[in-house]
Structures are given as C-alpha cells and as structure tokens.
Interface confidence: medium
C-alpha cells in the first residue's frame, strides 16, 4: 500500500490523543535506554510503511502485536485517514482473526514497540533531517 | 453481515443539544473500534469522534468539549451526545465499526439553524 495519500495531521493527532498512550503503557517497566533503535524511516510515507509492517507482521520471536490496544488504534487510524487502505488489507485481517494466538509479551515484542516508538517520534518531526 | 442503523437527528437551534444512536448488529461489538463520520453537503465525509474497546476516546478538534461519544456493548449501541451545536455541525452523521467503512447506513440528518 502507498502511504502518500493519508492524511497526516489527522494520523498525527491519533497517535498523540491515544496510540502513544498505549505505546508506553505496553513499555511499562523497561527503560527507555535498554533497547538501541535500528529501524528508521525517512518520510512520513515511509514511516507509516515501516510503522505498519512492525506492527502487522508476525516476526521471529513477536507474533502477538496485531491484538494489542495500539495496534488496534493504529489499524483505525490508518483504515479511516489513508484512502482505500482498509480494502488492501481486509482479507488479511479476516484471517488474521480465523487465527487468534494468545496474546505474549516476549523481550523481542518490547524491542519491537521500542522500534515502533521511534518510528512514530519520526512520523510526527518529519522536518527533521536524517541522523 | 454487519448492519448499521442511525438515529436521533433532527432539526435543532444554535446552542442546543441531540443524541444520535447507532444500533450494530453481525459482530462482537466491544471488540471493534466504533466512529461517528458526518459529510456536509459539497464536503468529505470527516470522523467526529471514535470509542475503543478499552474505552478510550478520540475526537476532531472542532467538536472536543462539545460532543462525548459513548458505547453500550450489552445493547451494540453507540451513542454520540452533541451539546452546545453550531450551524457547521449541520451533516447526515454516519457511524462506522473498525474495517467496516464501506457498510455505512442511511446515516441521520442533523440541521443547526434558527
């Protein structure tokens, strides 16, 4: 999916009433230095591209996110800000749901919010220049 | 199928109050997210507000203060309480369930004027 046509400030807005909450209620507990950033993204298309595959994506090691409450947030505000987004991605959830695993909170799922937070930080200071 | 039904507009003065309802049925609904969009004649359809299953609220900046959304899971209903509305809240609201955005209902009708 192309990220190019979302709309962004609204997308920011989500993240900033909610979906940050949700971030470090799910971090609650780990330091923030425990865990080195190694995903970057350098646009805000690119962000929600990078921010959409950590949170979807099953991964070695993490394959509980897609049920978390910010992952949830982050669907809704994806599904109503960026055009034509939800039809790419129904079937995908539907099986998705047919599938349900136990929700688990692994060190490699703490790392990969810890990425997923520094991707949002990215999305929301898109002026900035690339470290 | 997941079916939407919306009420409770009407035709309201400057300064007054309404509370829409929208009944949902084919889903589990306290685990969705749930919206109120609204279009205004000539504009896109824009989300006013959204409730999650935790219980969390969102709302656009234009209605914050304003308008409080709420959710009966034992009855799939929603609820948006629209308090102190302008002439530009004037709009057919519509809501929404989670992937749902293309089973919209006949929305409802609210109209600020005097």
């Known amino acids: 999916y192309d990220f190019t046509n979302c709309d962004f400030e609204k997308i920011k807005a989500a993240y900033l009433s909610t979906i940050s909450k949700d971030l470090i209620t799910y971090m609650s507990g780990t330091k923030s230095t425990e865990f080195n950033n190694t995903v970057s993204c350098s646009n805000r298309p690119h962000c929600l591209t990078e921010i959409q595959s950590l949170t979807f994506n099953p991964t070695a090691g993490c394959a509980s996110l897609a049920k978390e409450m910010f992952a949830m947030k982050t669907k809704a505000a994806l599904a109503i800000w960026c055009p034509g987004y939800s039809e790419t991605q129904i079937n995908a959830t539907q099986a998705m749901k047919k599938r349900r695993k136990r929700k688990v909170t692994t060190n490699k799922c703490l790392e990969q919010v810890s990425q997923l937070q520094g991707l949002w930080r990215r999305f929301n200071r898109p002026l900035l220049k690339q470290q | 199928e997941v079916q939407l039904v919306e009420s409770g507009g009407g035709l309201v003065q400057p300064g007054g109050s309404l509370r829409l309802s929208c009944a949902a049925s084919g889903f589990i609904f306290s685990s969705y997210w749930m919206g109120w969009f609204r279009q205004a004649p000539g504009k896109e359809r824009e989300l006013v507000s959204a409730i999650f299953s935790d219980g969390s609220t969102y709302y656009a900046d234009s209605v914050k203060g304003r308008f409080t959304i709420s959710a009966d899971n034992s009855k799939n209903t929603a609820y948006l309480q629209m308090n102190s509305l302008k002439p530009e809240d004037t709009a057919v609201y519509y809501c929404?369930?989670?992937?749902?955005?293309?089973?919209w209902g006949q929305g409802t009708l609210v109209t600020v004027s005097s």
């Open positions: 929404a369930i989670d992937w749902y955005l293309n089973s």
